[in-house]
């Protein structure tokens, strides 16, 4: 078991891989969307700038009972250095408008694709 430890538990996922996997998951969500995502739930929109991953998690974590975004919520928690719980909003999170989860995911996906193309993986 000692010898296999490294094999069974590979080291940290490279940031580029983690970002690519998050993008793939968001693409999957948008393409498989038949009924309104999360039944039309609305969340706070975010500034897609510094602290974006934590802000995205802070917004989406409030939506419960929506299996379609549970994996995204888990993946975003890997990008956010601090623990995020429902109802928590950082000072970076400006609450100016709410949008449907479907639109939130589309906006986030477009921005993450741009970051990936530019090589900004963190």
């Amino acid at each position: 078991l000692t010898c296999l430890g490294g094999f069974a538990s590979p080291g940290p996922v490279p940031p580029s891989t983690a970002l690519r996997e998050l993008i793939e998951e968001l693409v999957n969500i948008t393409q498989n969307q038949k009924a309104p995502l999360c039944n039309g739930s609305m969340v706070w929109s975010i500034n897609l700038t510094a602290g974006m991953y934590c802000a995205a998690l802070e917004s989406l974590i409030n939506v419960s009972g929506c299996s379609a975004i549970e994996k995204t919520q888990r993946m975003l928690s890997g990008f956010c250095p601090h623990k995020v719980s429902a109802g928590q909003f950082s000072s970076l999170h400006v609450r100016d408008t709410k949008i449907e989860v479907a639109q939130f995911v589309k906006d986030l996906l477009l921005h993450l694709k741009k970051l990936f193309r530019e090589g900004q993986f963190n």
Epitope: P36, N39, S41, V63
Partner: nanobody, 116 residues
């Protein structure tokens, strides 16, 4: 089970006022963030306003800022939306919603028609 019932809609002339109410049951109202959302004929959902559980935080869409006021009475499990200086573009079905829940848990809505 979450239940919400809106009332107070109707036909009003441009520049007029209406007060919408929403009675909530089936959840702990006083700790819930609450929203007003609207849907104009043939259009998508548009967020209108949000109020925090404590009433300390109130938030408005730019399109209604300065004209609409959201409030709540936790002792009556009731959410309100005071709508002043109404415009034709405010015509919509208005829904009260427990924040972050899907449409299946929203009320049936109340129709507001602004027309001369």
């Amino acid at each position: 089970e979450v239940q919400l019932l809106e009332s107070g809609g109707g036909l009003v002339q441009p520049g007029g006022s209406l007060r919408l109410s929403c009675v909530a049951s089936g959840f702990t109202f006083d700790v819930a963030e609450m929203d007003w959302v609207r849907q104009a004929p043939g259009k998508g959902l548009e967020w209108v306003s949000t109020i925090s559980p404590s009433r300390r935080g109130t938030y408005y869409a730019d399109s209604v800022k300065g004209r609409f006021t959201i409030s709540r009475d936790n002792s009556k499990n009731t959410l309100y939306l005071q709508m002043n200086s109404l415009r034709a573009e405010d015509t919509a079905v208005y829904y009260c919603a427990k924040a972050y829940t899907g449409r299946s848990l929203w009320g049936p809505g109340t129709l507001v028609t602004v027309s001369s």
